[in-house]
């Protein structure tokens, strides 16, 4: 007699075989907050940007990627304290002389109004009200993201 | 009438509420290989270490973390070609003068016998037979990992 969870494993496996989708997260893990189709984890501790990237990765997540101004505002609304800064997944690419998301896409200049310099060793943080360029070695909090809904398996045949 | 997948969402949600576990991956995605309780993605293309870290992260996975010599050997057994090197999630921390996994733990000196120098801008790669220190800017393949089984949500509270 299979448990309901074991049965689910079979059901979802069969579904994935048909659709090449993976189950994805069905709901946000403990300590993560849902924002639309994402789960966000706002760290309490601080780290340089590269350690923050590594931390999100070991949590099988990504530093926050922000699609547009609307998503930025909704994310900022979740920040309680005006004085706190959080790393997101955007830094300055010296070779490409541009702000670059960790997924490889360049920043659309209309999306975020960045305060500070675009130069080597600059990474992007957000506060409750603004977006800042900081030295990547600065130790501040960070935000990890996970896709909440089942996503088409585009990244898997993907890598 | 709920579909079996919708029912599963409820079942797994209820299970998670009881155990604070998340569903995790029920099976490995396309192109990923199962090794015990992990799904591994051996890239075909090449990247510097930091780009490899970012690639795994955007795939909601981590550069490979190796627990012990036994896991190293089993991973190496999946590498077909003697000449190919793969980045893993281990690099040299200059400030701490030690090899450090991307999850923040230090290398147990008994686990891996590293060929090459422990110095700034050194990252670790594995081949079919050995473990090497390479310049992090070198373009080689990389290995991403995802936990296959539902994992206790141990990595989330401590951020």
């Amino acid at each position: 007699q299979k448990s309901s969870i074991e049965k689910c494993s079979v059901d979802i496996q069969q579904s994935r075989n048909k659709t090449t989708e993976r189950p994805g997260l069905l709901n946000c893990p403990i300590y993560w907050q849902q924002l639309r189709e994402k789960c966000l984890l706002f760290s309490h501790t601080v780290n340089p940007w590269n350690n923050s990237l590594a931390d999100c990765s070991t949590k099988e997540s990504s530093l926050l990627l922000i699609r547009d101004k609307d998503e930025l505002i909704h994310t900022q609304n979740l920040i309680r304290d005006k004085a706190i800064l959080f790393w997101i997944g955007l830094n300055f690419s010296l070779s490409e002389k541009n702000w670059k998301w960790i997924n490889g896409s360049f920043l659309n200049s209309n999306d975020l109004e960045i305060r500070g310099d675009a130069k080597e060793n600059s990474c992007i943080s957000i506060s409750q009200t603004s977006v800042y360029s900081e030295y990547c070695s600065t130790e501040i909090r960070w935000i990890c993201q996970k896709e909440l809904t089942p996503v088409r398996n585009k990244v898997y045949p993907d890598s | 009438q709920k579909s079996s997948i919708e029912k599963c969402s409820v079942d797994i949600q209820q299970s998670r509420n009881k155990t604070t576990e998340r569903p995790g991956l029920l099976n490995c995605p396309i192109y990923w290989q199962q090794l015990r309780e992990k799904c591994l993605l051996f890239s075909h293309t090449v990247n510097p270490w930091n780009n490899s870290l970012a690639d795994c992260s955007t795939k909601e996975s981590s550069l490979l973390l190796i627990r012990d010599k036994d896991e190293l050997i089993h991973t190496q057994n999946l590498i077909r070609d003697k000449a190919i090197l793969f980045w893993i999630g281990l690099n040299f921390s200059l400030s701490e003068k030690n090899w450090k996994w991307i999850n923040g733990s230090f290398l147990n000196s008994n686990d891996l016998e590293i060929r090459g120098d422990a110095k700034e801008n050194s990252c670790i790669s594995i081949s079919q037979t050995s473990v090497y220190s390479e310049y992090c800017s070198t373009e080689i393949r990389w290995i991403c990992q995802k936990e296959l089984t539902p994992v206790r949500n141990k990595v989330y509270p401590d951020s």
């Epitope: 997924n103 490889g104 890598s159 | 890239s43 293309t45 090449v46 373009e139």
Partner: antibody, heavy 121, light 107 residues
Amino acid sequence: EVQLLESGGGLVQPGGSLRLSCAASGFAFSTYAMSWVRQAPGKGLEWVSAISAAGGTTYYADSVKGRFTISRDNSKNTLYLQMNSLRAEDTAVYYCAKPLDSSLWADFDLWGRGTLVTVSS
Amino acid sequence: DIQMTQSPSSVSASVGDRVTITCRASQGIDSWLAWYQQKPGKAPKLLIYAASSLQSGVPSRFSGSGSGTDFTLTISSLQPEDFATYYCQQASVLPITFGGGTKVEIK
């Protein structure tokens, strides 16, 4: 819109040179290895060359090795193919192609429309 | 280099027919095989990757199977828009190699 657009093809004499360009848009170009694939008139597909995402690693088909050079400018989202010492057998439609995943060289899910290179005296 | 041999080189079929195209690799490539469709004057279109995974937007009448050295593309019920040339391609090792193509013509 996700697309690749080749340019730079044309008529060239044997021994001559051409530089093809491929402008990418709508996806994270700098995270993907990219390839050139060609097709001679009435013939099948032939892979020509590939370049890693960061641009430091390149590969070539034996038929073009030493004559063609692949390169990329990630700041411009552009892929290039410098073709020297052209021969009649290089006459083909040249396509740039993107793989399905950032970890793959092949399984091309996005192709340009192609640019015709004709080598003739 | 891995040689990819496709057969037949051409096939005549009618709408509604089941069409099978085979591809053989000169050495084992696990499941690193893709299938493409190409129509005259157009770029190729990815149909199947990883030997059997259907690319997004491709009709379910297309299916792929096989592993190692022998692979098959099947069109379960041929439609008018399926008349084209089909290519297999191995992605196991560089250089990437394609099969010679199979032209599916109207009977």
